[in-house]
Structures are given as C-alpha cells and as structure tokens.
C-alpha cells in the first residue's frame, strides 16, 4: 500500500484513493489558476513512464515559495519510495527541456487520469 497518512485519514491510504486525491489536487490547481502558476517558473520536464512520481517530485521540489504546489509536492513524496531533496536528479530523470510549471501540472494530470482509468494505482 502507498502510505499517505495525514491526507484523508490517519492510517495507510489505499493506492486508488491516494491517486484520486492527487488527481483532485492537480485539477484544483489548474481550475483555480488566475495568475501564471508559480510566477511562470520553469522546471525540467519528465518522462511519464517508470519512476514518474519520483521524477515529478525531483522536478517540482526545486520550486520554492509557490504555495499553490506545496500540497502536490507533499503528496508526490508519498508515492516516491526514497527521500528527494532540491537539486537531486536520479539517473532515470533525463534533463532535456524545461517547461512552465503550469504545463508540467497539465501534462502530469492528463497522464494520471489515464492511469486511474486503466486501474494502475501504483
């Protein structure tokens, strides 16, 4: 089970619930976006394949002072089995292009919705 205690309940959260909550948070970010998200900050795009959650966290954790994505950063840390620090990039994370945080969130959301529909909760 993905352990995400503290988000919806005090104990371990089923992976399907954790993924649904992450999707809901990303939807919330995209719908409530008035000004450019995180002041137009640019982050490394990621491969939406194996190790996606850690890669997404490695990318977004570098953005500081952006309250809009703080909850997403915390949620992603629950999906990633190792501790991630700013400036840390795993060998799986190929740095080839930077995109705005808003585009990053949209791309991630589309992919997570697809995974949810297909029942891939881990």
């Amino acid at each position: 089970l993905t352990c995400l205690g503290g988000f919806a309940s005090p104990g371990p959260v089923p992976p399907s619930t954790a993924l649904r909550e992450l999707i809901e948070e990303l939807v919330n970010i995209t719908q409530n976006q008035k000004a450019p998200l995180c002041n137009g900050s640019m982050v490394w795009s990621i491969n939406l394949t194996a190790g996606m959650y850690c890669a997404a966290l490695e990318s977004l954790i570098n953005v500081s002072g952006c309250s809009a994505i703080e909850k997403t950063q915390r949620m992603l840390s629950g999906f990633c089995p190792h501790k991630v620090s700013a400036g840390q990039f795993s060998s799986l994370h190929v740095r080839d292009t930077k995109i705005e945080v808003a585009q990053f969130v949209k791309d991630l959301l589309l992919h997570l919705k697809k995974l949810f529909r297909e029942g891939q909760f881990n």
């Epitope: 002041n39 900050s41 500081s64």
Partner: nanobody, 116 residues
Framework: EVQLLESGGGLVQPGGSLRLSCAAS????????MDWVRQAPGKGLEWVST????????WYADSVKGRFTISRDNSKNTLYLQMNSLRAKDTAVYYC?????????WGQGTLVTVSS
Amino acid sequence: EVQLLESGGGLVQPGGSLRLSCAASGFTFDREEMDWVRQAPGKGLEWVSTISPSGRKTWYADSVKGRFTISRDNSKNTLYLQMNSLRAKDTAVYYCAKAYTGFRYWGQGTLVTVSS
C-alpha cells in the same frame, strides 16, 4: 534584493551573431542554476538554455542546439548567451532567470530582432 539586468540585444541580419549578458546581484550567484528564457511577439515563454552553478553542465532547447552557447563568469556575477547563425524565428525578448523562481526575479529583458 535579487536583480538581473540583461543587455546585448539588437537588430541583426539572418546568419549573424549576438552576445547577451546578464549582470546579477542580490543573491549568491555561484550557487544558483541559471536560465535563459525567451518570449517571441504574441507567443508564450520558451526555455532556451540552462547552466549549472559551476558552469560545467549546460542544457539547450532543440531549437537552439549547436547555435547558442550559455556560459557564466562567477567572479563577475555575469551570465552570457552567445548566439550564432541567428534566424528570424529567434526574434524575441530574452530574459535571464534565477532557475525555479519565476518572473518575480527576472530582469526587463533584451530584445533580439533578426531581420534582413
């Protein structure tokens, strides 16, 4: 207070060259990853290039790879972008940016116009 001041833009013919500079102050420059970002008229932001704090690692957008070179002089707190073989599609306002901070820490930009 973080300040970034770009310079070096101008009008250049296709195939020509320009060197952009960005003077940084108000933060520990040699600890920060730095970006060049551009915005073409009526378009969104486009990432151009990134350089690591030491300057040893560099990354480029496919659209500029092999033509642009990013560099930095940490002793002068200055970031550079050498632009060669310029094309009309490179016309844009170029901004230097402290990575991951967004435009609250950008300078006013420098306009590069590539036209014959």
